[in-house]
């Protein structure tokens, strides 16, 4: 029979993607770098179905995703179009709130305790989720 590609150990398969869920917290940039070293990226949510899957695995815990507006417009880390894509913001969000007293606004998106999205200060140490395409998961990494 044909060989079936599998996700790496400790990664969870769903709809032709592999996901890894952290148990500790990092700032968004450090979480982003962690996923890049895995030859993966912070999770990019493209459907309600994927939203429910991720939400089920992370529980009611603030968790970074691969969405930010650090350079102006909101962008997904894998280039998925933000404007036409799936969104699940909390009411009144994103608000780029400056009242937190940490300097600057809020440029990184995370899942909140109910799964809906909020923008927050990128330096906060939240959990994170890495994602990679299943076909890519079994391939050798690119030469860097």
């Amino acid at each position: 029979g044909s060989e079936r590609t599998c996700c790496p150990v400790n990664w969870v398969e769903h709809e032709r993607s592999c996901y890894w869920f952290s148990r500790s917290g990092k700032a968004w940039a450090d979480a982003d770098n962690y996923c890049r070293l895995e030859d993966a990226h912070l999770v990019v949510v493209t459907s309600w179905e994927e939203q429910k899957f991720v939400q089920h695995h992370i529980g009611p815990v603030n968790t970074w995703m691969g969405l930010h507006d650090q350079n102006g417009p909101w962008k997904w880390v894998d280039g998925t179009d933000y404007e036409t894509g799936f969104k699940n913001w909390r009411p009144e969000q994103p608000d780029d709130w400056y009242g937190h007293g940490l300097g600057g606004g809020e440029d990184c998106a995370h899942f909140t305790d109910d799964g809906r999205w909020n923008d927050d200060v990128c330096q906060r140490p939240y959990r994170w989720v890495c994602e990679t395409e299943l076909d890519k998961a079994s391939q050798e990494p690119p030469l860097l």
Epitope: N10, R23, A27, D30, N33, Y34, L37, D39, P141
Partner: antibody, heavy 123, light 107 residues
């Protein structure tokens, strides 16, 4: 207290094998990539290999590619370096080192490098 | 491969003097440049990470600056215990590389 404890060094024969270990404690091991760095006697530091946090991806210096294998057991909080086809030029102190985060705020006394383990390759 | 070149190779300095060590990268590495101190028979210690981030517990006389290709480690008011070899290291891309080291001796 955060610690990295290197072990497994010793005398290896040219063409032979050794396996180094690095036992980690005091931090969430699978949340960090890990590295091996070596230092030949009287020389500078040389990066050897890096493994991603989950172990999914590995990276090697050209000088050890195809001979050395980095791996990790996250259930045991341990990093490994399997050294095969040893050469005289592999003689060095080998250090394991934790990947540094930009925003990490480790407490005082934290040392992201092991104490080193000496590998001597000689017949 | 990104080559890191340190200046000077060695330096003999009087206590309380200011020491400046530079590290030049052969291509842009952003802020992914780290500084280590190594004393004889000891493992390297992190001084500065990501060009300018002071590492926990490191004396305030050590500071780092720069981005892109040019970086500087500064030791304000050198102390006798600072006699060591200092290395820069880039984590921007693989293969990761180190500078050749700068040996600081006390006069």
């Amino acid at each position: 207290e955060v610690q990295l404890l290197d072990s497994g060094g010793g005398l290896g024969q040219p063409g032979g094998s050794l396996r180094l270990s690095c036992a980690a404690s005091g931090f969430t091991f699978d949340s960090y990539a890990m590295n091996w760095v070596r230092q030949a006697p009287g020389k500078g530091l040389e990066w050897v290999s890096t493994i991603s946090g989950t172990g999914r991806r590995t990276y090697y210096a050209d000088s050890v590619k195809g001979r050395f294998t980095i791996s990790r057991d996250n259930s045991k909080n341990t990093l490994y370096l399997q050294m095969n086809s040893l050469r005289a030029e592999d003689t060095a102190v080998y250090y394991c080192a934790k990947e540094e985060d930009y925003y990490d705020s480790s407490g005082p006394g934290f040392d992201p490098w092991g104490q080193g383990t000496l590998v001597t390759v000689s017949s | 491969e990104i080559v890191l070149t340190q200046f000077p190779d060695s330096q003999s300095v009087t206590p309380k003097e200011k020491v400046t060590i530079t590290c030049r990268a052969s291509q842009n590495i952003g802020s992914s440049l780290h500084w280590y101190q190594q004393k004889p028979e000891q493992s390297p210690k992190v001084l500065i990470k990501y060009a300018s981030q002071s590492f926990s517990g490191v004396p305030s006389r050590f500071s780092g600056s720069g981005s892109g290709t040019d970086f500087t480690l500064t030791i304000n008011s050198l102390e006798a215990e600072d006699a060591a070899t200092y290395y820069c290291h880039q984590s921007s891309s693989f293969p990761r590389t180190f500078g050749q080291g700068t040996k600081v001796e006390i006069k």
